[in-house]
């Protein structure tokens, strides 16, 4: 069976957006009007992995784009890109670890954490117009909570 | 082989629309994204946008409300379409194919560019 | 918008001279960039990739070096047929960048 998915957009928990500055890279800033049309609306596959009531693994790729959000380690840290796959093969049900993110759901928040690597998640600074990254700390001064909206394919 | 053959008007009238085809064959524009690059007569590259296989598009944010890009994977065609042309829109325009170098965080370049077709913004 | 400076417009060589073309951007772009040739009347033609990798059938003459801000082409013992223009691309942000030029000429 192919595997389900769903379009949406992501914000974080100050209503920070995601955009795309350049092909390798999200950065989360406030967006009004016109401007909200540049929001990168994420194509989130429900795949194989770990599952419970309140947390389900997806795989979050740019809708139209053969790009997915992945984790990896760079210089012995674990990183957050965007890496380009085979658009004939993505997505699929079982992906790579990488590409695997527990969606977490807690008081109508959303949390990403990375498969691959426990306890890091998907973040963003407070600061406006900074690269989304992979971060290891929750509850501390980086954002890991995100609410998300549906967009109709 | 892989190969692009852009065509194009030639003249175009100031503020008239200006749209040129880049019809590809070697390769499938469902997996494959294809750019769009101009040369003004002497002078450097520009780029003008990209559409992605899965036919999601980004531009170059200075031209982008005059710019349209899209395609026909089945007729392997990728369309440019500029609106308002004005002299200094006068140019050789290129579409190229994007690399694909799969697993890369970094791939965005082009490889192969087709012969270009040379459009005059003139009255 | 990230500027990709090529500082030399022109450059003299002679055949079988070693040449070094440089491209400096104004911001970190890693490894996105590109390396393309362009003949008179041609389209521009595919060197080098991610800063240091040719393109299949490039010849080994042609290496890209650099990381960062600072790019090089390098064309050991240069042949007749490398007058050219050479142009780097950074494909790190948008828009694209391409740097202004380099031709490559005979002394």
């Known amino acids: 069976a192919p595997v389900r998915s769903l379009n949406c957009t992501l914000r974080d928990s100050q209503q920070k957006s995601l955009v795309m500055s350049g092909p390798y890279e999200l950065k989360a800033l406030h967006l009004q009007g016109q401007d909200m049309e540049q929001q990168v609306v994420f194509s989130m596959s429900f795949v194989q992995g770990e599952e419970s009531n309140d947390k389900i693994p997806v795989a979050l790729g740019l809708k139209e784009k053969n790009l997915y959000l992945s984790c990896v380690l760079k210089d012995d840290k674990p990183t957050l890109q965007l890496e380009s796959v085979d658009p004939k093969n993505y997505p699929k049900k079982k992906m790579e670890k990488r590409f695997v993110f527990n969606k977490i759901e807690i008081n109508n928040k959303l949390e990403f954490e990375s498969a691959q690597f426990p306890n890091w998640y998907i973040s963003t600074s407070q600061a406006e117009n900074m690269p989304v990254f992979l971060g290891g700390t929750k509850g501390g001064q980086d954002i890991t909570d995100f609410t998300m909206q549906f967009v109709s394919s | 082989e892989v190969q692009l053959v852009e065509s194009g008007p030639g003249l175009v009238a100031p503020s008239q629309s200006l749209s040129i085809t880049c019809t590809v064959s070697?390769?499938?524009?469902?997996?494959?994204?294809v750019h769009w690059v101009r040369q003004p007569p002497g002078r450097g590259l520009e780029w003008l946008g990209v559409i992605w296989g899965g036919g999601g598009t980004d531009y170059n944010s200075a031209l982008k409300s005059r710019l349209s890009i899209s395609k026909d994977n089945s007729k392997s065609q990728v369309f440019l379409k500029m609106n308002s042309l004005q002299t200094d829109d006068t140019a050789m325009y290129y579409c190229?194919?994007?690399?694909?170098?799969?697993?890369?965080?970094?791939?965005?370049?082009?490889?192969?560019w087709g012969q270009g077709t040379s459009v005059t913004v003139s009255s | 918008d990230i500027v990709m400076t090529q500082s030399q417009k022109f450059m003299s060589t002679s055949v079988g001279d070693r040449v070094s073309i440089t491209c400096k951007a104004s911001?970190?772009?890693?490894?996105?960039v590109a390396w393309y040739q362009q003949k008179p009347g041609q389209s521009p033609k595919a060197l080098i990739y991610l800063a240091s990798n040719r393109h299949t059938g490039v010849p080994d003459r042609f290496t890209g070096s650099g990381s960062g801000t600072d790019f090089t082409l390098t064309i050991t013992n240069v042949q007749s047929e490398d007058l050219a223009d050479y142009f780097c691309?950074?494909?790190?942000?948008?828009?694209?960048?391409f740097g202004a030029g380099t031709k490559l000429e005979l002394k």
């Open positions: 190229a194919r994007n690399t694909n170098y799969y697993g890369s965080t970094y791939d965005h370049a082009m490889d192969y």
């Open positions: 070697g390769f499938s524009l469902s997996r494959y994204s």
């Open positions: 691309l950074q494909h790190w942000n948008y828009p694209l960048t």
């Open positions: 911001q970190n772009v890693r490894t996105a």
